[in-house]
Interface confidence: low
């Protein structure tokens, strides 16, 4: 009784769908209730199928949902444990173990890669210094280094963090910033580049012609805050002489006014 | 950057035993395939085996089973590979390398040459 | 096992000329889960490692010249070295990840005329 196996290695992107296969030997009509099938990575039990039923109840809860025992290849003398979702931690050696007669097992390899494909971009404007902030952010494993470059190949020096992601532990979510003093319809590129030779990642940003009126209240405040503070104080100083009339109630007036001009920076900050 | 430093040249009987180490830095040693490497003077690469340090899981060449022994300290980040019955066809450089992902030998050590002789 | 075979077994070149270098498997390379051809070359000058050059049979690992190109699919591939340098006198391996054991051609060593 031997089991043979394709592939004893598998590769799958993270997220992706996997069906790993195992073949037996199985002359005419297959007999289910004599048939055992166990599938399991390192310590952990992922398929325990006996007495011609899957039993749930051993199952390592990270494979809950999402592993399965394909039961209409088993006929084909198949054991094919289809993993969906594929997780960073699914990657290991996998063990399936069939018994039918006579018992054998096989190991296969399943490597679990996480490209930074999607990556998101943002383009803002300064509106001070007219210094744009180009954004590039993406999530992927294991590490990467973000590459900013212009279409003339020149390399340019930008801010990279990288923290964990919420969406798995092992993923990494990696954002770099670059500010730089360019031009409409220039071209820049982030590239995200993997420790190892996994291939990168390039997204391109295009300069806009105008950056559209941005939408935040700090942008606006920026722009029209002096203006109004400094029209704030005039009214402030023209209501205080006309109420009271006397130079001190002006320097208290004023000196609330100093005190909510401060509180409106420490906002703007905040902003 | 990922570094593989590789024990010392070994001197050793026919019908002894060796055990020679491979320290990983730079980079997670648990998540990546270890994979050991021979190489006889004047000779091409022959691919021994790997071990999962995570798991301590092996892979081993039909060729090296029972002549390879791969483990892996996860504490001290280093894999080692025990030769065993050594005669002088063992004599050879054997190079730990590194697998990233699920691209080819990406990061090796620098050797480590075990002669065989009497 | 698959077998790897490499041609030239040596070869002699001037610096600046172009070389080809082949490489042979006894079957497919090709994995069909990602379309990619699990070959590798590596590059090993006398008294050091061996040096990882290109992977996925046509990709340039990071750092590697642009000098060197890696062509092919399948059983056949080749790469090809414009304007030889003379560091990049070595000898070259091709070796297969796809099914194990992993195994390696016997090399092509590349030598100055």
């Known amino acids: 009784f031997t089991i043979t196996v394709s592939k004893d290695l598998y590769v799958v992107e993270y997220g992706g769908n996997v069906t790993m296969e195992c073949k037996f030997p199985v002359e005419k009509q297959l007999n289910l209730f004599a048939l055992i099938v166990y599938w399991e990575m390192e310590d952990k039990k992922i398929i325990q199928f006996v007495n011609g039923k899957e039993d749930l109840k051993v199952q390592h809860s990270s494979y809950s949902q999402r592993a399965q025992l394909l039961k209409d290849q088993l006929f084909l003398g198949k054991a094919a444990l289809q993993i969906t979702d594929v997780r960073l931690q699914d990657a290991g050696v996998y063990c399936c173990l069939i018994g039918y007669g006579g018992a054998d097992y096989k190991r296969i390899t399943l490597k679990v890669h996480a490209p930074y494909r999607n990556i998101s971009q943002r383009i803002s404007v300064d509106p001070v210094t007219s210094e744009h902030e180009l954004m590039c952010q993406a999530e992927g494993y294991p590490e990467a280094e973000v590459i900013w470059t212009s279409s003339d190949h020149r390399v340019l020096s930008g801010k990279t963090t990288i923290t964990n992601s919420n969406r798995e532990e092992k993923l990494f979510n990696v954002t770099s910033t670059l500010n730089i003093n360019a031009t409409a319809n220039e071209i820049f590129y982030c590239t995200f580049q993997r420790s190892g030779p996994e291939e990168n990642n390039t997204a391109e940003l295009v300069i806009p012609e105008r950056l559209p009126v941005p939408a935040s209240e700090r942008t606006h405040f920026m722009i029209l805050g002096p203006f109004l503070l400094l029209l704030g104080v005039v009214l402030a100083v023209t209501f205080c002489l006309k109420k009271h009339g006397r130079m001190m109630d002006v320097e208290k007036c004023c000196t609330r006014d100093r005190n909510s001009k401060k509180r409106n920076d420490i906002q703007f900050e905040e902003t | 950057q990922v570094q593989l430093q590789q024990s010392g040249a070994e001197l050793v009987k026919p019908g002894s035993s060796v055990k020679i180490s491979c320290k990983a830095s730079g980079y997670t040693f648990t998540s990546n395939f270890m994979h050991w490497v021979k190489q006889q003077p004047g000779n091409g690469l022959e691919w021994i085996g790997w071990i999962y340090p995570e798991y301590g899981n092996t892979k081993y060449n039909q060729k090296f089973d029972g002549k390879a022994t791969l483990t892996a300290d996860k504490s001290s980040s280093t894999a080692y590979m025990q030769l065993s019955s050594l005669t002088s066809e063992d004599s050879a450089v054997y190079f730990c390398?590194?697998?990233?992902?699920?691209?080819?030998?990406?990061?090796w050590g620098q050797g480590t040459l075990v002669t065989v002789s009497s | 096992d698959i077998a790897i075979t490499q041609s030239p077994s040596s070869v002699a070149v001037s610096v600046g000329e172009t070389v080809t270098l082949s490489c042979k498997s006894s079957q497919s390379l090709l994995y069909s889960e990602n379309q990619k051809d699990y070959l590798g070359w590596y590059q090993q000058k006398p008294g050091q490692t061996p040096k990882p050059l290109i992977y996925w049979a046509t990709n340039r690992h990071t750092g590697v010249p642009d000098r060197f190109t890696g062509s092919g699919s399948g059983t056949d591939f080749t790469l090809i070295i414009s304007s030889v340098q003379a560091e990049d006198l070595a000898d070259y391996y091709c070796?297969?990840?796809?099914?194990?054991?992993?195994?390696f051609g016997p090399g092509t060593k590349l030598e100055l005329k």
């Open positions: 070796g297969q990840y796809l099914v194990y054991p992993f195994t």
């Open positions: 390398a590194s697998e990233e992902a699920v691209i080819s030998l990406v990061y």
